[in-house]
């Protein structure tokens, strides 16, 4: 039985050329987190954090994606094309798979505030 919940940074905005932290947090379960996948809006994999093998960043993103903090992901040198949905997928044992969604809006404005709040999707 899946008892856990995924909390995410929800809807966030950041300015073009800047960076942003995508963060998910799994709570209310004792399950092992064996792997976390980070996917982009087109469902292409950005990164994998495997308990045994550590962090692996997809080569196409290695210059703009940094692992962490924690199980989160940092996107750097943001472009307007980075606007869209991002998904964290927590593979756990014995619970199974938990999935969280974050919507990132990249703004042209230099005064865009990076607002991040934790919410349950």
């Amino acid at each position: 039985m899946m008892t856990g919940t995924i909390e995410t940074t929800g809807n966030i905005s950041a300015k073009k050329g800047g960076s942003v932290i995508l963060q998910c947090h799994l709570s209310s379960t004792m399950a092992q987190v064996t792997q976390v996948n980070w996917e982009q809006h087109d469902h292409s994999l950005l990164a994998i954090r495997n308990a045994e093998l550590g962090w692996h960043i997809y080569p196409a993103f290695k210059d703009r994606v940094a692992p962490g903090p924690g199980l989160g992901l940092t996107l750097q040198s943001l472009t307007m094309n980075d606007t869209g949905e991002y998904f964290c997928t927590y593979h756990t044992y014995p619970d199974g798979t938990y999935r969280g969604r974050i919507f990132l809006e990249v703004l042209e404005s230099s005064v865009a505030e990076h607002s991040a709040r934790f919410q349950i999707p």
Partner: antibody, heavy 122, light 107 residues
Framework: QVQLVQSGAEVKKPGSSVKVSCKAS????????ISWVRQAPGQGLEWMGG????????NYAQKFQGRVTITADESTSTAYMELSSLRSEDTAVYYC???????????????WGQGTTVTVSS | DIQMTQSPSSLSASVGDRVTITCRAS??????LNWYQQKPGKAPKLLIY???SLQSGVPSRFSGSGSGTDFTLTISSLQPEDFATYYC?????????FGGGTKVEIK
């Protein structure tokens, strides 16, 4: 049933390099990673590094960093481990092992190659 | 790196005996622990994953327990084919590390 078939035994001179292959038969690399583990004569198991073939990226144990290179060819379902600057202490049996990714990542190394003996001697 | 310490390093037992092998981690690894069996000249074989889950095809006389830092592999009734070396391995933190092994010999 997936099997991992490794290349044959090697005898190498100190200072040289060795490249060991590991071919998956009866399956593909798409949802797996490959780890390399070595075992010196009469000693225990030592993890060297691992690769996620769909990414082509590898991570290494600090002890082997800079001296080991792990690669994979998805088209032939073959992984490779190259160890350079060989010394006598590198004499060991080298194993490749399959690791599940994704929803089955809780398994350990559940399929192993038969092992490749590498002897380093002048 | 997390250090894994197994005890005893070797033991002698008879067929039918109950055998217990312990593994201690240098820091908490939750239940991210696997047990492997290795026979001379052969590759290791996965017995137990996630500290207590039996790998498919492994006889039920093998069981694993523990969490945190202390773990146990138990063979309830030793069979002739069980004489081998057993290794624990943590997969909680990169890089994965193995215990030094426990050799189970015939008394």
């Amino acid at each position: 049933q997936v099997q991992l078939v490794q290349s044959g035994a090697e005898v190498k001179k100190p200072g040289s390099s060795v490249k060991v292959s590991c071919k998956a038969s009866g399956g593909t690399f798409s949802s797996y990673a490959i780890s390399w583990v070595r075992q010196a004569p009469g000693q225990g198991l030592e993890w060297m590094g691992g690769i996620i073939p769909i990414f082509g990226t590898a991570n290494y144990a600090q002890k082997f960093q800079g001296r080991v290179t792990i690669t994979a060819d998805e088209s032939t379902s073959t992984a490779y481990m190259e160890l350079s600057s060989l010394r006598s202490e590198d004499t060991a049996v080298y194993y490749c092992a399959r690791l599940h990714l994704g929803s089955s990542a809780y398994y350990g190394m559940d399929v192993w190659g038969q092992g490749t003996t590498v002897t380093v001697s002048s | 790196d997390i250090q894994m310490t197994q005890s005893p390093s070797s033991l002698s037992a008879s067929v039918g005996d109950r055998v217990t092998i312990t593994c201690r981690a240098s820091q908490s690894i939750s239940s991210y622990l696997n047990w492997y069996q290795q026979k001379p000249g052969k590759a290791p074989k996965l017995l137990i994953y996630a500290a207590s889950s039996l790998q498919s095809g492994v006889p039920s006389r093998f069981s694993g327990s523990g969490s945190g830092t202390d773990f146990t592999l138990t063979i309830s009734s030793l069979q002739p084919e069980d004489f081998a070396t057993y290794y624990c391995q943590q997969r909680y933190v990169f890089p994965p590390t193995f215990g030094g092994g426990t050799k189970v010999e015939i008394k």
